[in-house]
């Protein structure tokens, strides 16, 4: 098996990626400048720490979480880093153009980087459904389209529905999940005979995937609280997220054992189910008034996640061609919806005493917001899938799916693994 890229991709990828990088540098040169206003160092450091948490989540957490394939672990981690680096750059520019540009130049602050990292995280969630079936050139396209779609979705929602930064960004779970699933649906599905073993998980990569899950577990409270306006909101968001993910870990491990005939625990279930509470609680993490509610939500999310991991992979493998271990897509789609439903319930409770048909109006707005996120995710995902199918990208042949040797130089390996 050749360890080289196909010749055409070797020409295409560096040219495409470096041209894009040069274009980004030019855009930064002409259109951006740093925030020059007076700010004390302590405030700056505190603000940077949140961004740092998000970067750890993205680079290490999601990078390693997707690395459980037997023969695709290198690519998973490195491609994730590549996408994160590219996605953050484009997201900073895009957010600036959409929100600030009429005033002249785009002002870059630590908050811009925070927002951009969260936007790029969307791609890292989506890509779980297609990793192993695409090359880097295709991933560049996916990054550009998804970050652009998410940026525009956020702007539209902000302008039409008057939502704040947090509510705006919390659609990321549903958006990323449906985007990834619709891209996967467009890609060639069947794994040819003899390659089934490549999409199986192995012990060492599974351990690194568990490491990724642990990093995400540790930093999920930072993600859910990053865009909130007041200290009390952030405090509540951190506490509630922590309670929810704590309970979802217990539920994931015990639920996984319960779901197995011999009572054994599935690594795949645990990898994603430990995060279930964090996703489900995301939209309303700052609003939940007491710990027990967050814990109940974590319990329900953990059960949904384990149940989904048990019954949905068969369907997803047949229809979408998603391997059994890549369950983040449908996991996030279910849990993201759960989170949105919880918020709609809170909305109903909030408007009960308002009269004048306000309940219906508010709920309609919220459902409209969610529907818009799903529709834009599906449409942009399908567009991306169609783009990725173009011959120009020289996609890996189905026989070379989930194979690090297609992309990486392994000097110690003459042939095969």
């Amino acid at each position: 098996m050749s360890s080289k890229y196909p010749r055409s991709v070797r020409r295409c990828l560096p040219l495409w990626a470096l041209t894009l990088e040069a274009a980004l540098i030019l855009l930064f040169y002409f259109f951006t400048h740093y925030d020059a206003s007076l700010e004390d160092q302590k405030g700056l450091v505190a603000s940077y720490q949140v961004g740092q948490d998000l970067t750890v989540m993205a680079a290490i957490g999601l990078g390693f979480l997707t690395s459980s394939f037997r023969r695709h672990s290198w690519s998973s981690v490195a491609f994730n880093l590549f996408m994160l680096a590219l996605g953050v750059q484009w997201a900073i520019l895009l957010d600036g153009f959409l929100s600030q540009f009429p005033s002249g130049k785009v002002v870059i602050t630590l908050f811009s980087i925070r927002l951009a990292t969260m936007s790029a995280l969307s791609v890292l969630i989506s890509v779980d459904a297609v990793l192993g079936k695409v090359n880097l050139a295709q991933l560049v396209v996916m990054v550009l389209v998804e970050v652009t779609a998410l940026g525009n979705l956020r702007m539209v929602i902000s302008n039409i529905f008057n939502t704040d930064y947090h509510m705006n960004m919390m659609h990321i779970y549903v958006f990323a999940a449906y985007f990834g699933l619709s891209v996967a649906w467009c890609l060639p599905k069947p794994l040819p005979e003899g390659t089934e073993d490549k999409d199986q998980t192995a012990t060492i990569p599974s351990l690194s995937a568990m490491l990724g899950a642990l990093f995400l577990w540790m930093f999920w409270p930072s993600f859910n609280s990053a865009l909130l306006r007041s200290p009390i909101e952030r405090k509540n968001a951190v506490f509630n997220t922590y309670y929810a993910v704590a309970v979802s870990v217990v539920t994931a491990i015990s639920g996984s054992s319960l779901a197995h005939p011999q009572g054994k625990i599935s690594k795949t279930y645990v990898h994603s189910a430990v995060l279930a509470g964090g996703v489900a609680v995301g939209t309303s993490c700052h609003l939940i008034p007491s710990p027990w509610l967050a814990m109940v939500l974590g319990l329900v999310a953990g059960l949904i996640s384990v149940g989904g991991a048990k019954y949905l992979p068969g369907c997803c493998n047949r229809v979408l061609g998603i391997p059994h271990s890549s369950i983040m897509g449908y996991n996030f789609s279910l849990l993201g919806l759960l989170g949105e439903i919880i918020y709609i319930v809170l909305l109903v409770l909030d408007t009960v005493g308002a009269g004048n048909g306000m309940i219906g109006f508010q709920v309609l707005l919220s459902i409209g917001e969610l529907s818009l996120a799903i529709v834009i995710a599906l449409m942009s995902g399908l567009l991306t899938g169609l783009l990725l199918n173009l011959k120009i990208w020289k996609a890996p042949h189905e026989a070379k799916y989930f194979d690090d040797q297609v992309f990486w130089k392994f000097p110690h390996l003459a042939v095969g693994f």
Partner: antibody
């Protein structure tokens, strides 16, 4: 006791610049968002700008966007409003106010619970 | 946009006074009321439609019906003569109503 004290107002020519200060006592700016609000002679209150408690976000009224900058120095526990390209329309009493949050059911409600006495800015040739 | 009515109002001591604020779009329960006397700092009276700020007398109350918000002073006292503003905190810009000037009759 929680107090806000504005300073830095005065008479300035059109096109000129001025920097207002607001010194906070009895609480720390590191844990509170802050607003600037103004009142032009014979007019009502007009919200001008907001800075989040961690300094990460600054919002401005359309009428001042690109000309005014809100900032703070937490070591001095002081809020600032840098005003540039001033015009007669900017003549007003400028107040600083503390941003406070209370949990609603479906989102937080914000309000200005502590105000300073104000400092007068006159833009005139 | 917040439209306050009336823009000015004359009343006597111990009168019951009602000031209305209408929002041009839905702002939920995110409305606050302030009292402002010339030469002094504005003072928060009510936040989140009906929650009374600590230290504010119980004669002040707030209510909501859809996008119409009401500030009621149940029994007017001499110190209540001032200008009253409603303000929305639903989304920036955090607009104020044009004010209601409450004068002694």
């Amino acid at each position: 006791q929680v107090k806000l004290l504005e300073s830095g107002g005065g008479v300035v020519q059109p096109g000129g610049s001025l920097r207002l200060s607001c010194e906070a006592s009895g609480f720390t700016l590191r844990s509170s968002g802050m607003h600037w609000v103004r009142q032009a002679p014979g007019k009502g209150l007009e919200w001008v700008a907001l800075i989040w408690f961690d300094g990460s976000i600054r919002s401005y009224a359309e009428s001042v966007k690109g000309r005014f900058t809100i900032s703070r120095d937490t070591s001095k526990n002081t809020l600032y409003l840098q005003m540039r390209s001033l015009s007669a329309d900017d003549t007003a009493v400028y107040y600083c106010a503390r941003d406070k949050a209370v949990r609603g059911i479906s989102r937080y409600n914000y309000y200005m619970d502590v105000w300073g006495k104000g400092t007068t800015v006159t833009v005139s040739s | 946009v917040l439209t306050q009515s009336p823009s000015s109002l004359s009343a006597s001591i111990r009168d019951r006074v009602t000031i209305t604020c209408r929002a041009s779009q839905n702002i939920g329960s995110y409305l606050n009321w302030y009292q402002h006397k010339p030469g002094t700092a504005p003072k928060l009276l009510i936040y989140a439609v009906s929650a009374l700020q600590s230290g504010v007398p119980s004669r002040f109350s707030g209510s909501r019906s859809g996008t119409d918000f009401t500030l009621t002073i149940s029994s007017l006292q001499p110190e209540d003569f001032a200008t009253y503003y409603c303000q929305q905190s639903y989304s920036p810009p955090y607009t104020f109503g044009q004010g209601t000037n409450l004068q002694i009759k």
